[in-house]
Interface confidence: medium
């Protein structure tokens, strides 16, 4: 399986909400011996490998923000901890999983990584990640709502988190 980032860059005004999204695609084993662990963290663009370093998002670690389930099941963080920090991660039946960040500030700007670990009990763990940039802007040059730039082309799309 692979992870695709629908958008490689999100540009948002301060105070807005944004939902960063990744999608798991390719063959997904739905056997009872296979589970998926999905999470989010901040990182930096390393010289060797992007998303290698794991930094917290608003003081919450990747462990705090994880989802854990079998196959393409729906799940979401119900952690009070995450919600108190204006964060919520979620996963749907179609392989999409996301993190919603509320009331963005300039400090939220940076590189965000989604991580998926496929756990085949007794055999192996296979992990893949996706990366995307979030730019939070303020002042007259800031957009009125979030603009997302697709990974594959330069056409932008206006998005607003619910």
């Amino acid at each position: 399986f692979k992870v695709a980032t629908l958008y490689s860059l999100y540009v948002c005004p301060e105070g807005q909400n944004v939902t960063l999204t990744c999608r798991v695609f390719g063959p997904v084993d739905k056997g009872h011996d296979v589970t998926f662990y999905k999470t989010w963290y901040r990182s930096s663009r390393g010289e060797v490998q992007t998303c290698s370093e794991r930094r917290p998002i608003r003081n919450l670690t990747f462990q705090d923000l994880h989802l854990h389930h079998g196959g393409h099941q729906a799940a979401n963080t119900s952690h009070d901890l995450a919600q108190r920090h204006g964060l919520e991660s979620a996963s749907d039946h179609h392989g999409n999983f996301s993190i919603t960040m509320r009331n963005l500030t300039l400090l939220d700007s940076g590189l965000y990584c989604c991580l998926v670990v496929e756990i085949r009990h007794h055999h192996s763990e296979h992990r893949v990640h996706g990366a995307m940039e979030l730019q939070v802007q303020t002042g007259k040059d800031a957009p009125s709502s979030c603009v997302a730039y697709p990974s594959s082309s330069q056409e932008s799309e206006n998005i607003t988190a619910a």
Epitope: T35, H66, V117
Partner: antibody, heavy 118, light 106 residues
Framework: EVQLQQSGPELVKPGASMKISCKAS????????MNWVKQSHGKNLEWIGL????????SYNQKFKGKATLTVDKSSSTAYMELLSLTSEDSAVYYC???????????WGQGTSVTVSS | QIVLTQSPAIMSASPGEKVTMTCSAS?????MFWYQQKPGSSPRLLIY???NLASGVPLRFSGSGSGTSYSLTISRMEAEDAATYYC?????????FGSGTKLEIK
């Protein structure tokens, strides 16, 4: 604060069985695997196996199959390792450690010393 | 199973000296992890995913490598770094540790 509190030292007779506990606190128990590691003579570390409190799934090092049995009690956030048919070779310090998937064992218990002697 | 061979088994260094130890895997692994253990204490995570410092680890520690060859470096040895260091792989079951490198202070 993340803590893994293991049960105290044990002196057991050859052929007996025993159970070590590891009580977790300060984190979401089901978001991690609980791993067990053996350290003999203060030297080599050996991974015994893991259990996922999320679904009870276990994975064992083949070397320890039949020797160790891993269980969890989600209600008390406690992991257990039962050691069976003990011999002098099983004398060691045993550690529990939490591990997030795709990561490392970032918190360890203080260790439980097991001495097998008649 | 993947066998991890650490060298040297024992080494000593003076304060301020640069220290490098290696970990060789019998077959290729995706990432290496390093732990530090002092006598009477539990192992402590130092480095994850080959080159990233775990929380609270001093910047004088660094890790590098790929495939079957990995290393841990301490840029300037300090007395508190005297310990045994273990490498570990999570790439395939059973997860294995190296035999350790004991680092002593001169």
């Amino acid at each position: 604060e993340v803590q893994l509190q293991q049960s105290g030292p044990e002196l057991v007779k050859p052929g007996a069985s025993m159970k070590i506990s590891c009580k977790a606190s300060g984190f979401s128990f089901t978001g991690y695997t609980m791993n067990w590691v053996k350290q003999s003579h203060g030297k080599n570390l050996e991974w015994i196996g893991l259990i996922s409190p999320y679904n009870g799934g276990t994975s064992y090092n083949q070397k320890f199959k039949g020797k160790a049995t891993l269980t969890v009690d989600k209600s008390s956030s406690t992991a257990y390792m039962e050691l069976l048919s003990l011999t002098s070779e099983d004398s060691a310090v045993y550690y529990c450690a939490r591990r997030a998937y795709g990561y490392a064992m970032d918190y360890w218990g203080q260790g439980t010393s097991v001495t097998v002697s008649s | 199973q993947i066998v991890l061979t650490q060298s040297p088994a024992i080494m000593s260094a003076s304060p301020g000296e640069k220290v490098t130890m290696t970990c060789s895997a019998s077959s290729s692994v995706s990432y290496m992890f390093w732990y530090q253990q002092k006598p009477g204490s539990s192992p402590r995570l130092l480095i994850y995913d080959t080159s990233n410092l775990a929380s609270g680890v001093p910047l004088r520690f660094s890790g590098s490598g790929s495939g079957t060859s990995y290393s841990l470096t301490i840029s300037r040895m300090e007395a508190e770094d005297a310990a045994t260091y273990y490498c570990q792989q999570w790439s395939s079951y059973p997860f294995t540790f190296g035999s350790g490198t004991k680092l002593e202070i001169k």
